[in-house]
């Protein structure tokens, strides 16, 4: 005849076998994953007495020192969780929940996807154009993103004895700024009591050893009686643009 | 498919320029970098110098300024390194190389002699 | 500029065995760097990017590992077809550089 037991929501739970308690949460077994994220698997069960819970990978063992920086388990949680996973992380997660009265088990297939290596990506909308008054002060945004170290230069178009071309038909450049040993926070360019002079077009330049992108902001420089018309405010936006 | 073709062999005499081609195709020319690198047998492999299609730019390493110039071609997808002053130091195997690194070209083998 | 320091210079491996190689940088160049296949008549073959990324198409029994000055590539279960020389790159700065190579010969 069947046992009970007191469970804490105090209703009386019959002894037996593991039992899956939520299904739906291990629907999905393929999880592709880009590399360096974390990734979590969760198989909640219930039963009793209390089961226990192992995790196996490619139906061996799974033990810590199997991957660098090795894993956590949250038993509460009836989770794994592997952080930073690379491509030798790929491969079938068995969970195995077990008690005295029976085991069952499910099985997720990790399949870790490698970055592509690309030229960098520069955020949508930035830098955005600007309006200051004469004397004002002015910041510009580049937010970008490379998986390679990216080179970041701010340049501006100037003139040159009241040209903008050189003999070539190229336009005078001058490099406001760019990242380096002496350069911190390289996606910022600060301008500090502007004339008339600095109005103009600045662009954002990233490099890395694949390729290049660039953007560029207006700045309009307004005499100091007139107040400046503030910008649309700027949402940064989850789109990227190359 | 990607591909970057090269000329098999350059024979020079010292003293004299040559200039080199790499015809790549399959991919936007003008969104990679294209990367020149020597190889002879003493010294294994050596990064020349990068030149961006799409405007021009180029990066050098200061061990070839002055000898190597890169030059890029939209319209057919050609990019060029030219050596001057050649001397027997000069001979190796120039390869273009995409910008990830990914794709090369067969190499062209530089031979200067008289 | 970053000098890469590879080693060893040479290894004779037999069919089956674990090859290790590492490339030490001079200076900081976080997972900058990839490796190379280099075999006689042909062209470097990329393996390994961004430090410890394998390249599409490359046999999972070619790894890498490291970052900041200090990587490891390694072949698990060296075949006679991998007979080559392997180079180091580092992808951070300007002049991109090159270790100076490891052979590796098999018995």
């Known amino acids: 005849r069947p046992s009970f037991s007191l469970v804490e929501d105090t209703t009386l739970e019959p002894e037996g076998a593991p039992y899956w308690t939520n299904t739906e949460k291990m629907e999905k077994r393929l999880h592709a994953c880009p590399a360096a994220n974390t990734v979590k698997f969760r198989c909640p069960a219930g039963g009793n007495p209390t089961s226990t819970m192992r995790w196996l990978k490619n139906g061996k063992e799974f033990k810590q020192e199997h991957r660098i920086g090795g894993y956590k388990v949250r038993n509460q949680h009836w989770s794994l969780i592997m952080e930073s996973v690379v491509p030798s992380d790929k491969g079938n997660y068995t969970c195995l929940v077990e008690n005295e009265y029976g085991s069952i088990n499910h099985t997720y297939h990790l399949d870790v996807v490698e970055r592509s290596p690309h030229r960098p990506i520069l955020q949508a909308g930035l830098p955005a154009n600007a309006s200051t008054v004469v004397g004002g002060d002015v910041e510009f945004v580049c937010k970008v993103y490379s998986d390679a170290q990216p080179h970041i230069q701010w340049i501006k178009h100037v003139e040159k004895n009241g040209s903008k071309n050189g003999p070539d038909g190229l336009p005078y450049l001058k490099v406001l700024k760019h990242s380096g040993i002496n350069s911190s926070n390289a996606e910022v360019l600060a301008l500090f009591n502007v004339t008339e002079m600095d109005a103009g077009e600045y662009i954002c330049k990233v490099s890395n050893y694949i390729g290049q992108a660039n953007q560029s902001a207006w700045l309009t420089v307004l005499p100091k009686q007139q107040a400046p018309v503030r910008e649309k405010e700027i949402t940064a936006s989850p789109d990227y643009l190359e | 498919q990607v591909q970057l073709q090269q000329p098999g062999a350059e024979v020079v005499k010292p003293g004299a320029s040559v200039k080199m081609s790499c015809k790549a195709s399959?991919?936007?020319?003008?969104?990679?970098?294209v990367h020149w690198v020597k190889q002879t047998p003493g010294q294994g492999l050596e990064w020349i110098g990068s030149?961006?299609?799409?405007?021009?730019?180029?990066s050098y390493n200061q061990n070839f300024k002055g000898k190597a110039t890169l030059t890029a071609d939209k319209s057919s997808s050609t990019a060029y390194i030219q050596l001057s002053s050649l001397t027997s130091e000069d001979s190796a195997v120039y390869y273009c190389?995409?910008?990830?690194?990914?794709?090369w070209g067969q190499g062209t083998l530089v031979t200067v002699s008289v | 500029n970053i000098v890469m320091t590879q080693s060893p210079k040479s290894m004779s491996m037999s069919v089956g065995d674990r090859v290790s190689i590492t490339c030490k940088a001079s200076?900081?160049?976080?997972?900058?760097v990839a490796w190379y296949q280099k075999k006689p008549g042909q062209s470097p073959k990329l393996l390994i990017y961004?430090?410890?990324y394998r390249y599409t198409g490359v046999p999972d029994r070619f790894t890498g590992s490291g970052s900041g000055t200090d990587f490891t590539f390694t072949i698990s279960n060296v075949q006679a077809e991998d007979l080559a020389v392997y180079y180091c790159?580092?992808?951070?700065?300007?002049?991109?550089?090159f270790g100076g190579g490891t052979k590796l010969e098999i018995k």
């Open positions: 190389a995409r910008g990830d690194f990914a794709y």
């Open positions: 790159q580092q992808h951070s700065t300007t002049p991109y550089t």
């Open positions: 399959g991919y936007i020319f003008t969104t990679y970098n």
């Open positions: 200076q900081g160049v976080s997972n900058d």
């Open positions: 030149i961006y299609p799409d405007n021009g730019d180029t």
């Open positions: 961004s430090a410890s």
